[in-house]
């Protein structure tokens, strides 16, 4: 069964800067990745970035740099200030659309005990939805 993992890290140098890393553990070909915050995309969450393997990367503030890390993982840097700044308990979600598996989404947030600059290891997060 395919899985999605999500890792959230707060940067030590800037407390309003977060790095989100997501990966897809499956054999299919990824056709789209959507990163959102505040909940799953389409279920109250707000889209931060859309990464298409052929068409490019569309991102919304406070997303600063979204990129492909590998064929099946992405990273996103957020730099917020004021109302658009993420906070320590913000939930981030990643949805991977792949062929032939369909869509798989998981969410994660900063581990409660994390110090800035630290993060939990990238373990698979609970699968919230498989379309």
């Amino acid at each position: 069964t395919p899985e999605v993992w999500v890792q959230v890290r707060m940067e030590a140098t800037e407390l309003s800067s977060f790095t989100i890393r997501c990966g897809f553990l499956g054999s299919g070909s990824i056709s789209l990745v959507t990163v959102s915050w505040g909940g799953p995309n389409g279920a109250g969450g707000t889209t931060l970035a859309v990464l298409h393997p052929e068409r490019g990367i569309r991102q919304w503030a406070p997303a600063r740099q979204a990129r492909w890390e590998t064929q099946s993982s992405i990273s996103l840097i957020l730099e917020g200030s004021g109302a658009s700044s993420p906070c320590a308990n913000t939930t981030f979600c990643c949805k991977f659309a792949s062929f032939p598996e369909g869509s798989w989404e998981a969410c994660g947030s900063l581990p409660p005990s994390s110090d800035p600059g630290l993060s939990a290891p990238p373990t698979p997060a609970p699968i919230l939805r498989a379309d």
């Epitope: 393997p53 052929e54 068409r55 490019g56 569309r58 997303a63 740099q65 990129r67």
Partner: antibody
Framework: QVQLQQPGAELVKPGASVKLSCKAS????????MHWVRQRPGQDLEWIGE????????NYNEQFRNKATLTVDKSSSTAYMQLSSLTSEDSAVYYC?????????????WGQGTSITVSS | DIVMTQSPSSLAMSVGQKVTMSCKSS????????????LAWYQQRPGQSPKLLVY???TRESGVPDRFIGSGSGTDFTLTISSVQAEDLADYFC?????????FGGGTKLEIK
């Protein structure tokens, strides 16, 4: 063929607002994001933002977030950009442009541009 | 934001000559997923709007003469006009079309001697 029609010029007073139009024809209007680009005299092209005509979803360049507001009217296949609190720095040619079908940000069809002059 | 730098800012060539102009990006435009470079070139003739010539660094837009050749990878790109014509008098802009916000170079003005 694809056409994006824009008015030629507008003269506006400092502090005022202006709403620019871009009427699309020759393709399925809801299927392509519409982009707006600024070109000040002798300066670089600057991307202002984009709007998805199918659902009104917008995306702005941060430096224009408080200056420009993008909307569409699907029934007339027209995109609009409202510019507020105009100053002489906003005097420029403003283009609407359609994104290329195979990539988000290459722009394959452009309007002729609307020249905005801000002067009292 | 990705910064695009073009050189030279202007050049004057005679009809029939080969023209090359450069564009550099502050970060790589190579997408590791599909090995495509997200770099476009536009031509803007005097008093006209920009026209897309090349995208994905080397793919010519439909209807663009084959004397326009885009090349390069990563951060260094070149537009070559193999045999310049009088109608090529224009400003040429490069643009990264990889991620938001798309950004443009300052342009190269081509004058015909």
């Amino acid at each position: 063929q694809v056409q994006l029609q824009q008015p030629g010029a507008e003269l506006v007073k400092p502090g005022a607002s202006v709403k620019l139009s871009c009427k699309a024809s020759g393709y399925s209007f809801p299927s392509y994001w519409m982009h707006w680009v600024r070109q000040r005299p002798g300066q670089d092209l600057e991307w202002i933002g984009e709007i998805n005509p199918s659902n009104g979803l917008t995306n702005y360049n941060e430096q224009f977030r408080n200056k420009a507001t993008l909307t569409v009217d699907k029934s007339s296949s027209t995109a609009y950009m409202q510019l507020s609190s105009l100053t002489s720095e906003d005097s420029a040619v403003y283009y609407c442009a359609r994104h290329h079908g195979s990539t988000y940000y290459a722009l394959d069809s452009w309007g002729q541009g609307t020249s905005i002059t801000v002067s009292s | 934001d990705i910064v695009m730098t073009q050189s030279p800012s202007s050049l004057a060539m005679s009809v029939g000559q080969k023209v090359t102009m450069s564009c550099k990006s502050s970060q790589s435009l190579l997408n590791s997923i599909n090995q495509k470079n997200f770099l476009a070139w536009y031509q803007q003739r005097p008093g006209q709007s920009p026209k897309l010539l090349v995208y994905f660094a080397s793919t010519r837009e439909s209807g663009v003469p084959d004397r326009f050749i885009g090349s390069g990878s990563g951060t260094d790109f070149t537009l070559t006009i193999s045999s310049v014509q009088a109608e090529d008098l224009a400003d040429y802009f490069c643009q990264q079309h990889y991620s938001t916000p798309p950004t443009f170079g300052g342009g190269t003005k081509l004058e015909i001697k």
